[in-house]
Amino acid sequence: KFSKQSWGLENEALIVRCPRQGKPSYTVDWYYSQTNKSIPTQERNRVFASGQLLKFLPAAVADSGIYTCIVRSPTFNRTGYANVTIYKKQSDCNVPDYLMYSTVSGSEKNSKIYCPTIDLYNWTAPLEWFKNCQALQGSRYRAHKSFLVIDNVMTEDAGDYTCKFIHNENGANYSVTATRSFTVKDEQGFSLFPVIGAPAQNEIKEVEIGKNANLTCSACFGKGTQFLAAVLWQLNGTKITDFGEPRIQQEEGQNQSFSNGLACLDMVLRIADVKEEDLLLQYDCLALNLHGLRRHTVRLSRKNPIDHHS
């Protein structure tokens, strides 16, 4: 149950964490299970224990085997096992299945590929990334912290991605590579009856005569690419362009896609030099798509200047 598979390539650094967790203050002893021989903690050794971590700097094929870690506290001992396999480097480009970390899936909106196990190492940016052994080049690929971001993901982006970084231990550098598959899933979008987020229905907006005022119509229409979705303003049931008041203009806001994937649109109504007659108008925020149309109505009211007299 408390056993973990770990693997690496010869002449690369490999760091393994004890599968049994404990407080940093607990001592952890490591043993090579076949011989029950204790793993030294002195850093001058090629293989040494450092608390919860077992470090192979660098690893050799002969290091393969099962390692036992015992987490010792004042009241209990917990035992875990690390099954370590060190492989010879492949001469060809092919990365065998047994060297692959878990597959990750991405889509047009989410295309992060995390470099496996990197958190165990003392590394500095940037990471190097390869796809099917070719170094990734071009503005679509961005190495960011411990992950790779691919812009505008396409099905052709599926494949095996290898991250390469340098682990530093007491001034000595060791290379580490890790490979995982990336699959591209088609993110199914859908369309909903429009939902207006702002303004609230029958909202009263306070404005100051002679000042400028902005009203934002914001609505969401579903997930993914939306066809024939729009937000717009009407005055007394008339389109802004047909109303014929140059002081009142609408301006497209940003197309938004929120973290929950909802596709939303904004339209800002700008009223310059608010006049008394503007308070008599009915301002309709319309959101429409293939499913239908929804309307929220706003009216303006005069904001009374604050009386500063004591």
Partner: nanobody, 118 residues
């Protein structure tokens, strides 16, 4: 509502629905139908001056919805009628939503029967 009746397949009918009690500043009017033993379905809807219209796939190209704002009346011109168009047709109105979903409408007419025989 008015304009319902019996007609042969391939014939035409024009339904009309007059709304009262609202000041004109944008209203949606829609037509819905319900055949015996079936669920109510949206047929067509129109918002204010007809700039925004919605049609059920089953009637596209055959039915036309239009509006006379001066009379606060909405019309449904039904051409190339089929026996499956037989149903009670209802007019509905709402100030804030428009489309083919009946649950969004607040005001409903009594209905007019349309029967299409083969």
């Amino acid at each position: 509502e008015s304009g319902g009746g019996s007609v042969q397949a391939g014939g035409s009918l024009r339904l009309s629905c007059a709304a009262s009690g609202y000041t004109y500043s944008g209203i949606c009017m829609g037509w819905f139908r319900q055949a015996p033993g079936k669920e109510r379905e949206g047929v067509a809807a129109i918002y204010t001056n007809g700039e925004y219209t919605y049609y059920a796939d089953s009637v596209k190209g055959r039915f036309t919805i239009s509006q006379d704002n001066a009379k606060n009346t909405v019309y449904l011109q039904m051409n190339s009628l089929k026996p499956e168009d037989t149903a009670m047709y209802y007019c509905a109105a709402d100030r804030n939503t428009c489309g083919l979903r009946g649950d969004f409408y607040n005001y409903w007419g009594q209905g007019t029967q349309v029967t299409v025989s083969s």
